[in-house]
């Protein structure tokens, strides 16, 4: 062929049109292709019809095509394998109907930002779906069930915040799955079901560790040996488990499998059997501080925001230990509750009114008759509005695992060293790459409004720890991409003054404690 | 020391069912993943099932979906299998196994280099 290389390997013509500066398809390609590499040129916007002709194609690469736009129409009855990674797509496209035979799917690194409920309507034989690296804040809840087939999920360096409860349901192949480096601060009651799952990787999310983390506590103890940490050029089989990397993101990096839940409604506080799937509260050894605490029923279908508990479980009393936007019914109640030394509260906080922007309706009133306060649409005139100072952050590079522990990565990134081997089809960056140049982390979303009186502290606090999540990817040039955490703009009444050094606040949270 | 004793095995008519048990010693049971392994006459080890430490979460080999239950009680440091609707193809030695410490468990890894008991017989014949 004049533009593309052409070669037979047993059964299968794989043609090679990669980096030819195209900006269309290549014609007279042969009509028995089963393999075409489209990879690094400037297609901009891309037919599948146009390779209708191609009645043999298994595999297609349109990798880092600068595709803003995939046209879907006709159908390619045998295409397996599509890789449309490092691309511009900020939405992807309905694949069901063009590609009913496709087994894997790789849009990481992309534009996206949502995905509509029906996004894989018709792809009933998929068994591998890569969105790493996209702008996902949250998933619609039955986005997986046309592919019950599914194996591996990659939804890493991604800014979800919250997972649809059944998100999994029917997934009974499912063996990996990659939601490390994202903004996941709880994971929902049931969500892994009662399917094992050998490979899964959770780290680099702001773990809220409070009353509502207990059945991901649970799971991580029930599942320790298959919780990993990604590492750059390690074959997942090599790998080593380490549950221990899963983090308690308010309570300086405690693991979460080892939180110790005091304070928390037992089975027995309300009769609600299944809140926690009878998994049992499990004692702290350590000097025992006296606390209040509100008995408190969650409702189990309730929207929850992640900052219901702004700072460190540790306190384990007050109301603020309660989700927020939650509508629970309370008894107030003081009781002995163990703390480790290191976790012995420093200061006592009493909300009268405590109101999200996201939330229809709140009560946290630690007395019996709740007082209700409506949501803030905007900020009140009164109000100082706060942004986080970023604190500049050099990004590392973050990786996920092989998609099987025999085949490697769709998408590739740098090994951290020239000297580290990489199991991918790409080559280790030469020693001249670039290291990666520090960028500030700037949050972007959500906005928050507080509003928070009656405040009792020895003193006030303002804390602007941003969470450092960076992404460095790399493709035959090195494309620094920067995962930007939540812009955070905390809006509370009354005057303050700024510290630094209150361990109880929640890290990603900008406080202001009045007087 | 790790040890594993299997029994419950034994000869069934097709449509039968068995419950096999393994009891463990020499380790934390309660914190260890488990599996059931198999070896058919003349073949090599054939993974069948697996459940996690807390007994919450199982996962089946498709050859005996629907037909095998694994679970566990971890106060008796036991773990079971029940087999149903058995088919003459579920002759075998069936183990169970542990990985070792820092092993990476996996449905197809090699299954020789894991904590195995002794097996016990399971025949399916009419």
């Known amino acids: 062929h004049p533009i593309c290389e052409v070669s037979k390997v047993a059964s299968h013509l794989e043609v090679n049109c990669d980096k030819r500066n195209l900006t269309a398809l290549p014609p007279d390609l042969p009509k028995d292709t089963t393999i075409l590499h489209l990879s690094e040129n400037l297609l901009y916007t891309f037919s599948l019809a146009t390779l209708m002709p191609y009645t043999r194609l298994t595999q297609l690469n349109l990798d880092r095509c600068e595709l803003t736009k995939l046209q879907v129409d006709g159908t390619l009855p045998v295409l397996g394998t599509l890789d449309l990674s490092h691309n511009q797509l900020q939405s992807l496209p309905l694949l069901g109907q063009t590609l009913p035979a496709l087994t894997v799917l790789d849009v990481s690194f992309n534009r996206l930002t949502s995905l509509p409920l029906g996004a894989l309507r018709g792809l009933g034989e998929l068994q591998e779906l890569y969105l790493k690296g996209n702008e996902l804040k949250t998933l619609p809840p039955g986005l997986l069930t046309p592919t019950p087939k599914l194996e591996k999920l990659s939804l890493a360096n991604n800014n979800l915040t919250e997972l649809p409860a059944g998100l999994l349901n029917g997934l009974e192949n499912l063996d990996t799955l990659l939601l490390q480096e994202n903004s996941l601060y709880t994971i929902p009651k049931g969500f892994f079901g009662s399917h094992l799952l050998p490979f899964a990787f959770l780290h680099g999310n702001p773990w809220l560790c409070n009353c509502e983390i207990l059945y991901f506590r649970r799971w991580l103890q029930d599942n320790a040996e298959n919780v990993y940490v990604w590492k750059q050029g390690v074959d997942v089989k090599a790998m080593t488990s380490n549950v221990a990397s899963v983090q308690c993101d308010n309570s300086d990096k405690f693991p979460v499998y080892k939180y110790p839940g005091k304070g928390c409604p037992t089975l027995g506080d309300e009769g609600d059997t299944d809140l926690y799937d009878y998994y049992p509260e499990e004692d702290t050894e350590g000097d025992k501080v006296r606390a209040t605490r509100t008995v408190v029923k969650f409702p189990t279908k309730a929207h929850t925001t992640p900052w219901g508990l702004f700072y460190s479980w540790s306190t384990a009393s007050l109301d603020s230990q309660m989700p927020s936007s939650l509508h629970p019914t309370q008894e107030s109640t003081k009781e002995q509750t163990t703390f480790p030394p290191r976790w012995t509260p420093n200061f006592t906080l009493h909300m009268e009114s405590i109101t999200f922007s996201k939330t229809p309706k709140s009560t946290t009133e630690p007395t019996p008759s709740p007082t209700t306060s409506e949501p803030v649409p905007e900020p009140a005139p009164n109000m100082t509005t706060l942004e986080p100072t970023p604190s500049p952050t050099t990004p590392e590079p973050t990786s996920e695992p092989a998609p099987s522990p025999t085949t490697p990565e769709p998408t590739s990134e740098p090994a951290p060293s020239p000297t580290t081997p990489e199991p991918t089809s790409e080559p280790a960056p030469s020693p001249t790459t670039p290291e990666p140049t520090p960028i500030p982390t700037i949050a972007t979303s959500p906005t928050i409004l507080v509003s928070a009186t009656s405040l009792i502290t020895p003193k006030s606090t303002f804390l602007t720890t941003t969470k450092p999540v960076s992404l460095l990817e790399s493709t035959k040039k090195t494309i620094p991409e920067l995962d930007q955490p939540p812009k955070l703009r905390g809006v509370l009444q009354g005057h303050l003054e700024s510290s630094r050094n209150d361990p109880f606040l929640h890290p990603d949270f900008c406080c202001l404690l009045p007087l | 020391e790790v040890q594993l004793v299997e029994s419950g095995g034994g000869l069934v008519q097709p449509g039968g069912s068995l419950r096999l048990s393994c009891a463990a010693s020499g380790f934390t049971f309660s914190s260890s993943a488990m599996t059931w392994v198999r070896q058919a006459p003349g073949k090599g080890l054939e993974w069948v099932s697996a459940i996690n430490s807390g007994g919450s979460g199982t996962r089946y080999a498709d050859s005996v979906k629907g037909r095998f239950t694994i679970s566990r009680d971890n106060a008796k440091n036991t773990l079971y299998l029940q087999m149903n609707s058995l088919k003459p193809e579920d002759t075998a030695v069936y183990y169970c196994?542990?990985?070792?410490?820092?092993?990476?468990?996996?449905?197809?890894?090699?299954?020789?280099?894991?904590?195995r008991g002794q097996g016990t017989q399971v025949t399916v014949s009419s």
């Open positions: 196994a542990k990985r070792r410490d820092g092993q990476n468990w996996y449905p197809g890894i090699s299954y020789e280099s894991m904590y």
